[in-house]
Amino acid sequence: KKVVLGKKGDTVELTCTASQKKSIQFHWKNSNQTKILGNQGSFLTKGPSKLNDRVDSRRSLWDQGNFTLIIKNLKIEDSDTYICEVGDQKEEVQLLVFGLTANSDTHLLQGQSLTLTLESPPGSSPSVQCRSPRGKNIQGGKTLSVSQLELQDSGTWTCTVLQNQKKVEFKIDIVVLAFQKASSIVYKKEGEQVEFSFPLAFTVEKLTGSGELWWQAERASSSKSWITFDLKNKEVSVKRVTQDPKLQMGKKLPLHLTLPQALPQYAGSGNLTLALEAKTGKLHQEVNLVVMRATQLQKNLTCEVWGPTSPKLMLSLKLENKEAKVSKREKAVWVLNPEAGMWQCLLSDSGQVLLESNIKVLPTWSTPVQP
């Protein structure tokens, strides 16, 4: 018996070939012997089966002795043995129809689980293997699960259903809802304007939800909500904002926040959360602000940084075009009795400068100038 695999919703063509290469009488029946389709001369006739409105045949091939049964918009319950009777020949074809669907939704939040469920006819014992857009393979039976979805899992999943050494392939588009970056860090000199951007890693027609930025300043004992906002069809509207600092927010995506001035008291870490309509869970992006200040008080030139810096970062004070006078893996460095000239305070990571602040030290009889 020939086995043919079909996909739910697709069209399948079952073939039946007569030994004589001419148009003769034929009919297709199911396992209950119910007539599905046949011919009367050059006319196509349909039987009383439940497939009535979904079957057809290629009439152009009849006179070559080919009598196809075309079944459109396949359903799992179309799985059956189909019998073609043509002349004194009888051919049997077993059709197995499979469907593969993603749990509830194909738009899932980063960190959530994806479950792919195989619909299969009774009595079948298929195996399924799926490949993610980053090439990861998973294997299973009637269900396949991937826990902790990552951003790279967004895209087309290719799944192969194997049954009786035959295969049918499904492609499912999965969208992982997440910010492009899990975390970002902004380095600013005191007084500079700060821009925070939170680009999304996906695009959808309509995007509705609400969000909030909580901030834990390094100098503060507890975190506080800096801003809350709504998102309606990709339009952003601010609901509530603190008075200090008075953040400004862009009205369009990507989510964009502006802090008028970088000040030591604002240095710290923030967590922007976005709750999307009809989705359980929230999207998160961490943002960090590091602020630098260079000052001269009497005979002491000091450079300080505030905010979440890694222990491997180097803070240095140097006179322009000269070797560093002081370099430490600390958050403050100073030079006593600095000589006159343009001093540079540098925060660097393995030689790469992340932040720089210049301060002009005047001869001792005058006051310092901060450019």
């Epitope: 090439g135 393979n137 492609k171």
Partner: antibody, heavy 117, light 107 residues
């Protein structure tokens, strides 16, 4: 019987363009990925990338991204590998293979590409 | 990228010998490993998939084992037609990568 038949050997000059082919038969060409593998003279196998002829979805190895283009014409069950400007270092044997979710179960006979001035 | 390291690079053996080739992945690849055989001037041929499943038509003297990072290909009793180069390949994540090959020669 599953078969992948590749186009014949090519001798080209540096800077020239080239498109080699791989024709599949004996199976549903649109239902499997097709991969390309490079083997430089006396060396091992290198995975270049794959294409799904059903919708021309492609994935490249970072080493070959931008160096070659993989395409397919499902109407004639043929996959292609092409270069816009060949280099001497492109001299190699190129194989196409049917990709069964990562495993290359059937291979073409290979196309030898020689680039020399 | 996941690096695949085969050992030994070459191996001399006699007909009837039992031979083992190993393949190590730079990170865990579950059982997503294939073994191929390549004879001079020929295309590679698939022998083993999913680390231990024998491709249809491949003689049962070939077997594969392992999971995670360490894998082996064993030929229980070498036949004259088995002298060739063998490659392992991971297909756990893109880009799928091959080992550098093990050349099996007649002693």
């Amino acid at each position: 019987e599953v078969q992948l038949v590749q186009s014949g050997a090519e001798v080209k000059k540096p800077g020239e363009s080239l498109k080699i082919s791989c024709k599949g038969s004996g199976y549903s060409f649109t239902g499997y990925w097709i991969g390309w593998v490079r083997q430089m003279p006396g060396k091992g196998l290198e995975w270049m990338g794959i294409i799904y002829p059903g919708d021309s979805d492609t994935t490249y190895s970072p080493s070959f991204q931008g160096q070659v283009t993989i395409s397919a014409d499902k109407s004639i069950s043929t996959a292609y590998l092409q270069w816009s400007s060949l280099k001497a270092s492109d001299t190699a044997m190129y194989y196409c293979a049917r990709d069964q979710l990562g495993l290359f179960d059937y291979w073409g006979q290979g196309t030898l590409v020689t680039v020399s001035s | 990228d996941i690096q695949m390291t085969q050992s030994p690079s070459s191996l001399s053996a006699s007909v009837g010998d039992r031979v083992t080739i190993t393949c190590r992945a730079s990170q865990g690849i579950s059982s997503w490993l294939a073994w191929y055989q390549q004879k001079p001037e020929k295309a590679p041929k698939s022998l083993i998939y999913s680390a231990s499943s024998l491709q249809s038509g491949v003689p049962s003297r070939f077997s594969g084992s392992g999971s995670g990072t360490d894998f082996t290909l064993t030929i229980s009793s070498l036949q004259p037609e088995d002298f060739a180069t063998y490659y392992c390949q991971q297909y756990d994540s893109y880009p799928y990568t091959f080992g550098q090959g093990t050349k099996l020669e007649i002693k």
